[in-house]
């Protein structure tokens, strides 16, 4: 740091005083010197370092008519709002000729009520969920002791005896307020009051209860909500791939989710008018008077391909000698998917039922073994998709073909006479 020489007497006739006060105080340091000739610029030092951006003013008063007469120079340094960073040793410095002179030091000190560096913040927390709050204060004078308050009630018997900078709260079941007091020798400062709002916990176990081609029923387990009952839950659904045209180049932006509200209880919702055999994502959040929980993670779900909603139509079954002719038409009801084929079941009196997969044909010829008459033979047909069988038709009795009766219009496919499809009781 610059040092004055002893070769010449110091020009300073007035040195900076001392300032001690609380934060925010406004004060002025002043030094005065008397020089002969052109007045020099006065610099201010704090702890030996030149203050480049000091808020200082310099006044120069000549003591004679001539430039070479003596001058009185006064420099004033203004401290507008005292902060900890302003504290330290202050001196004035001048360059005269080839020499450097510094004044005697003055001291700026800070002393007052504690000052908060960090205060508790408002936040939301899930019910019965641990969290931390922070509070930090400083003097001088030190030490500064903290006392936490919950809903205006102290959490320790005396300042400094309880948690200090960080308060760990194991969980709340109602919305509460927290503040901290900072104590030092000058007195007490109280922080802002933070409101900790208790929201419901995130729902758990979001799952599918049932799936239909255009409908999904979902359920979930609500989380704890403290003393506040849940008012409703909200379900959101989006298309999983949003019908995105990845093949088409630019993918579509994500859609807004469809939002549905569910009364609670029950914690269940039916989502209808969905596209069959389509992937979706769903999530749920539940709300109390204090606000909504966080959302669950997105759950991928898919509407299934459906089974046909009705049986095949216009089934006829006739026998002509050793052959049985069965034919039918496609169900009139929605297929709810891709028709993969038909199943045929036949049964005689006192005989077990036999099932056949006919494929996509709408007729079949069965080769009957033996010459005996068939007793009460009935035939049922069902259509199926990848999702399974649709409803079976009502049993249609096998009728004997009579001369003049029209043969089936379609060419019939003969089933091979294998043991699997033979009727040994004929």
């Amino acid at each position: 740091a610059p040092r004055g020489t002893q070769a010449e007497e110091s020009p300073f006739v007035g040195n900076p005083g001392n300032i001690t006060g609380a934060r925010g105080l406004t004060g002025t340091l002043r030094c005065q010197l008397q020089v002969q000739g052109e007045p020099p610029e006065v610099h201010w030092l704090r702890d030996g370092q030149i203050l480049e951006l000091a808020d200082s003013t310099q006044t120069q008063v000549p003591l004679g008519e001539d430039e070479q007469d003596d001058w009185i120079v006064v420099s004033q340094l203004r401290i507008t709002s005292l902060q900890l960073s302003d504290t330290g040793q202050y001196q004035c410095l001048v360059f005269l000729g080839h020499q450097t002179f510094v004044s005697q030091p003055g001291y700026v000190g800070l002393e007052g009520l504690p000052y908060f560096l960090e205060e508790p913040e408002d936040r939301t927390v899930a019910a019965n969920t641990p969290f931390n709050l922070s509070c930090q204060a400083q003097g001088p004078p030190e030490p500064v002791d903290l006392l936490w308050l919950q809903d205006a009630v102290p959490l320790a018997t005396a300042p400094g005896h309880g948690p200090q900078r960080s308060l760990h709260v194991p969980g709340l079941n109602k919305t509460s307020s927290f503040s901290c007091e900072a104590h030092n020798a000058k007195g007490v400062t109280t922080s802002r009051t933070a409101t900790i709002t208790v929201l419901p916990q995130q729902p758990r176990n979001l799952h599918l209860v049932s799936r239909q081609p255009t409908e999904l029923e979902v359920a979930w387990t609500p989380g704890l909500s403290g003393i506040y009952p849940l008012t409703h839950c909200t379900l959101q659904a989006v298309l999983s791939d949003d019908g995105m045209g990845i093949q088409a180049g630019e993918p579509d932006p994500p859609e807004e989710p469809l939002t549905s509200q569910a009364s609670v209880p029950p914690h269940q919702l039916r989502l209808g008018s969905l596209h069959p055999h389509t992937p979706y994502h769903i999530r749920v959040a539940c709300t109390s008077s204090q606000g909504p929980s966080s959302w669950t993670h997105w759950l991928p779900v898919e509407t299934p391909e459906g089974v046909p909603l009705g049986p095949p139509e216009n089934i006829s079954a006739t026998r002509n000698g050793s052959q049985a002719f069965v034919h039918w038409q496609e169900p009139r009801a929605p297929l709810q998917g891709t028709l993969l084929g038909y199943r045929l079941a036949y049964q005689g009196q006192d005989t077990p039922e036999v099932l056949m997969d006919i494929g996509l044909r709408q007729e079949v010829t069965l080769e009957l073994q033996g010459d005996g008459s068939v007793s009460n033979l009935t035939v049922c047909v069902a259509a199926y998709t990848a999702a399974g069988d649709g409803p079976w038709s009502l049993p249609v009795p096998l009728e004997a073909w009579r001369p003049g009766q029209a043969q089936p219009v379609h060419q019939l496919v003969k089933e091979p006479s294998t043991p699997a499809f033979s009727w040994p009781w004929w």
């Epitope: 579509d252 994500p254 469809l258 008018s273 389509t278």
Partner: antibody, heavy 121, light 108 residues
Framework: EVQLLDSGGGLVQPGGSLRLSCAAS????????MSWVRQAPGKGLEWVSA????????YYADSVKGRFTISRDNSKNTLYLQMNSLRAADTAVYYC??????????????WGQGALVTVSS | EIVLTQSPGTLSLSPGERATLSCRAS???????LAWYQQKPGQAPRLLIY???SRATGIPDRFSGSGSGTDFTLTISRLEPEDFAVYYC?????????FGQGTKLEIK
Amino acid sequence: EVQLLDSGGGLVQPGGSLRLSCAASGFTFSSYAMSWVRQAPGKGLEWVSAISIGGGNAYYADSVKGRFTISRDNSKNTLYLQMNSLRAADTAVYYCAKPGFILVRGPLDYWGQGALVTVSS
Amino acid sequence: EIVLTQSPGTLSLSPGERATLSCRASQSVSNSYLAWYQQKPGQAPRLLIYGASSRATGIPDRFSGSGSGTDFTLTISRLEPEDFAVYYCQQYGSSPYTFGQGTKLEIK
């Protein structure tokens, strides 16, 4: 009963503007993406534009991109198509259409009666 | 964009016959999001098939759809007089949601 009522068609000069409206009733409008489809006289169907359930996402055919703007007002159950810088090639019957399922933008199971837009000098 | 090409452009058949209409996509249609519509003169289109193979409500069972990926077919098993119209396919899996150019089914 689902109803879609198209309005706002008319004769307009090339370079002019027109705004079509589609008033919807009989279903939960805000649960369905909506579309506009047009058909030039004697020609086939051309998909024009679609809008997501909340109105945040809009989709356009290349032929109208930058000139047409689709929008919706869910509080009024109304779909709009603002058409600017109109050309003779935009002459068509414009149909408002609703998909059969929530969230997906098709298939279109209900159609308005159509609004005729004629662009001619 | 996905281009849909329908064939034939015109199909001349008699009532009672079977009609097979084709729709080919330039790229795979995601989720088989393909629909078929029927349009008669002066009327709005009518949805017949969605999801490539599911019949819309109230559509007679003589109409059926099949296919996946890029090749799709609409079949009318036994033509009725009221079936003679223009038929369009549309993909709604990728924006822009394009239509085919149409197949006119006329009485022979």
